[in-house]
Interface confidence: low
């Protein structure tokens, strides 16, 4: 399916609006520090060029690849060297090395100010004054902070963002209408970004075989009535879509995602009974809906797996003939029977099954050797089951904030070398698993919890890769994608860690503490808690609880005082001294 002009092909397929949006996202994800106006200028130039190619595909440069066209455009930015330093060296390379170079310089933690939400009236005025610019600004600000955000999905978020303003800026109480919608979009957006980051890490660090295995397991859970061949086709197409998006090929990715949605809706009967309501929606909404669709009901009377995968005398023959296909079928059959298992657990079971066949098919009596393979799965299944049970009990006992604190202490003791902001961010997110998953029925708890934890721990891995400080983190992050969570769970107190020297400045607080939002206050207290554990890694739960209770009382007292700053100045050193004594 070759086209004379790739840029004309994508422009025609996607339409001008989506084309411009995706090019803006692509540029913003590559050059994360560039001002908005610079990106808009580049996008307009690319769009005008694309239109000339639509009019005449033989026009000059229209036959160039998208990487060449986009890379050439990015390399025209005058301030590339002073803004991005060595990233400017990418421009000396030829494609495809130049694009690979740009990809390697994507920054998961860019030094950008947090987005401040203006007053509602200010936002509504900006929306009405220039809706197009307002929405482009949204795409730009999100894309530069989340350089792996799933681009076609970001267009869906932008459409919802637009709809929220269109509705709420006309409402009687604009703020009451708009703010909850913006909060929801922000939270969903962060979750979507983190989920996509794991997909990209899976593809980039562990290869497409790892991603395909994940996709087989997940799609088999979602579509248990679909045949293996159907699931395999969806997996192949989905892998192509995500490989493209993770590789910066956003136009191809969006185009292929639309094709996949079309295929799924045209073949609902052989995929899932749950697709119908998605397929009536417009494109962006349809693709989102299909991605989030609930699991279909499992077929009745599925025969036992043991017959084909344990009892059959042909197991080794079938395995030898087509290893990946046989293992893929095993994973498909196991996953469709177990919507109650996490994808990561299913992948561990497939890995264990593969290891058993590798060993047993070379043995004197292979059948005798692998006859008990399913029994070996039991401890693998029980480990996440117990973990979820224990942590949900702890969450129900403590509530979210204190549960986060328990995790902060737990993870700081495991990997105290990791930076405090990273430990706070990751532990707070790990702690959100309670509210997200523990309220669910038993059959949904493990897939919710463990697969969410995999996403959060990937964030730790991605941040740690940028500034590696702990061999233990590197080991857990790089050895096995499916065993990351068990690897982190198994880490104990780091005995080799030299405690951090006490720094009174870290525990000095001011009156500005009182004007912070509840979330910001929590982050301040949790930052102090991490620093305490880094100073005294062997402190007991009771000691730490005592210090934190004193801290909360001290802050509350000073925030109620008439002269708040004087109170902090006077009570602060007392709190520090008392804390040191309590932890001595």
């Amino acid at each position: 399916d070759t086209h004379k002009s790739e840029v004309a092909h994508r422009f025609k397929d996607l339409g001008e609006e989506h084309f411009k949006g995706l090019v803006l996202v692509a540029f913003s994800q590559y050059l994360q520090q560039c001002p908005f106006e610079e990106h808009v200028k580049l996008v307009n130039e690319v769009t005008e060029f694309a239109k000339t190619c639509v009019a005449d595909e033989s026009a000059e440069n229209c036959d160039k690849s998208l990487h060449t066209l986009f890379g050439d455009k990015l390399c025209t930015v005058a301030t590339l060297r002073e803004t991005y330093g060595e990233m400017a060296d990418c421009c000396a390379k030829q494609e495809p090395e130049r694009n690979e170079c740009f990809l390697q310089h994507k920054d998961d933690n860019p030094n950008l100010p947090p987005l401040v939400r203006p007053e509602v009236d200010v936002m509504c005025t900006a929306f009405h004054d220039n809706e197009a610019t307002f929405l482009k600004k949204y795409l730009y600000e999100v894309a530069r902070r989340h350089p792996y955000f799933y681009a076609p999905e970001l267009l869906f978020f932008a459409a919802r963002y637009k709809a929220a303003f269109a509705e709420c800026c006309q409402a009687a109480d604009k703020a009451a209408c708009l703010l909850p919608k913006l909060d929801e979009l922000r939270d969903e957006g962060k979750a979507s970004s983190a989920k996509q980051r794991l997909k990209c890490a899976s593809l980039q660090k562990f290869g497409d075989r790892a991603f395909k295995a994940w996709a087989v397991a997940r799609l088999s859970q979602k579509f248990p009535k679909a045949e293996f061949a159907e699931v395999s086709k969806l997996v192949t197409d989905l892998t192509k879509v995500h490989t493209e998006c993770c590789h910066g090929d956003l136009l191809e990715c969006a185009d292929d995602r639309a094709d996949l949605a079309k295929y799924m809706c045209e073949n609902q009967d052989s995929i899932s009974s749950k697709l119908k309501e998605c397929c009536d929606k417009p494109l962006l909404e349809k693709s989102h809906c299909l991605a989030e669709v609930e699991n279909d009901e499992m077929p009745a009377d599925l025969p036992s797996l043991a017959a084909d995968y344990v009892e059959s005398k042909d197991v080794c023959k079938n395995y030898a003939e087509a290893k990946d296909v046989f293992l893929g079928m095993f994973l498909y059959e196991y996953a469709r029977r177990h919507p109650d298992y996490s994808v990561m657990l299913l992948l561990r079971l497939a890995k264990a099954y593969e290891a058993t066949l590798e060993k047993c098919c070379a043995a004197a009596d292979p059948h005798e050797c692998y006859a008990k393979v399913f029994d070996e799965f039991q401890p693998l299944v029980e480990e996440p089951q117990n973990l979820v049970k224990q942590n949900c009990e702890l969450f129900e006992q403590l509530g979210e904030y204190k549960f986060q604190n328990a995790l902060l202490v737990r993870y700081t003791k495991k990997v105290p070398q990791v930076s405090t902001p990273t430990l706070v961010e990751v532990s707070r997110n790990l702690g959100k698993v309670g509210a997200k998953c523990c309220k669910l029925p038993e059959a949904k708890r493990m897939p919710c919890a463990e697969d969410y934890l995999s996403v959060v721990l990937n964030r730790l891995c991605v941040l740690h890769e940028k500034t590696p400080v702990s061999e233990k983190v590197t080991k857990c992050c790089t050895e096995s994608l499916v065993n990351r969570r068990p690897c982190f769970s198994a880490l104990e107190l780091d005995e080799a860690y030299v405690p951090k020297a006490f720094n009174a400045e870290t525990f000095t607080f001011h009156a500005d503490m009182c004007t912070l939002s509840e979330k910001e206050k929590q982050v301040k207290k949790q930052t102090a808690l991490v620093e305490l554990v880094k100073h005294k890694p062997k402190a007991t739960k009771e000691q730490l609880k005592g210090v934190m209770d004193n801290f909360a009382a001290f802050v509350e007292k000073c925030c109620k005082a008439d002269d708040k700053e004087a109170c902090f100045a006077e009570e602060g050193p007392k709190f520090v001294a008392a804390s040191q004594a309590a932890l001595a």
């Epitope: 679909a226 077929p299 084909d308 079938n318 079928m329």
Partner: nanobody, 115 residues
Framework: EVQLVESGGGLVQPGGSLRLSCAAS????????MSWVRQAPGKGPEWVSA????????RYAESVKGRFTISRDNAKKTLYLQMNSLKPEDTAVYYC????????GSQGTQVTVSS
């Protein structure tokens, strides 16, 4: 592209026989277990029989045991279902699937058992 094309269905009297065939293409037929599934009017799909990739292991639903025989010819990439002693309750669209799925991935072939 994976394709499964069934044939051999038709109208038969109770007690009669039919042999269904399923021609496969677009995938490594010899590496996959296969099944026959049927769907009677107004009912959900019902798994009928399965065979492993080599053809050594076969399994049947209780309702067809002793009457139906599943087999395969990997060289011809074809799956078969020999149906003897047919009953009116065997009336359905029969289709073949990869693995042990009960999803319709093909058009199927109509079997009607009636006097």
């Amino acid at each position: 592209e994976v394709q499964l094309v069934e044939s051999g269905g038709g109208l038969v009297q109770p007690g009669g026989s039919l042999r269904l065939s399923c021609a496969a293409s677009g995938f490594t037929f010899g590496s996959f277990g296969m099944s026959w599934v049927r769907q009677a009017p107004g009912k959900g799909p019902e798994w009928v029989s399965a065979i492993d990739s080599g053809g050594a292991d076969t399994r049947y639903a209780e309702s067809v045991k002793g009457r139906f025989t599943i087999s395969r010819d990997n060289a011809k990439k074809t799956l078969y279902l020999q149906m003897n002693s047919l009953k009116p309750e065997d009336t359905a669209v029969y289709y073949c699937t990869i693995g042990q799925s009960t999803s319709r991935g093909s058009q199927g072939t109509q079997v009607t058992v009636s006097s």
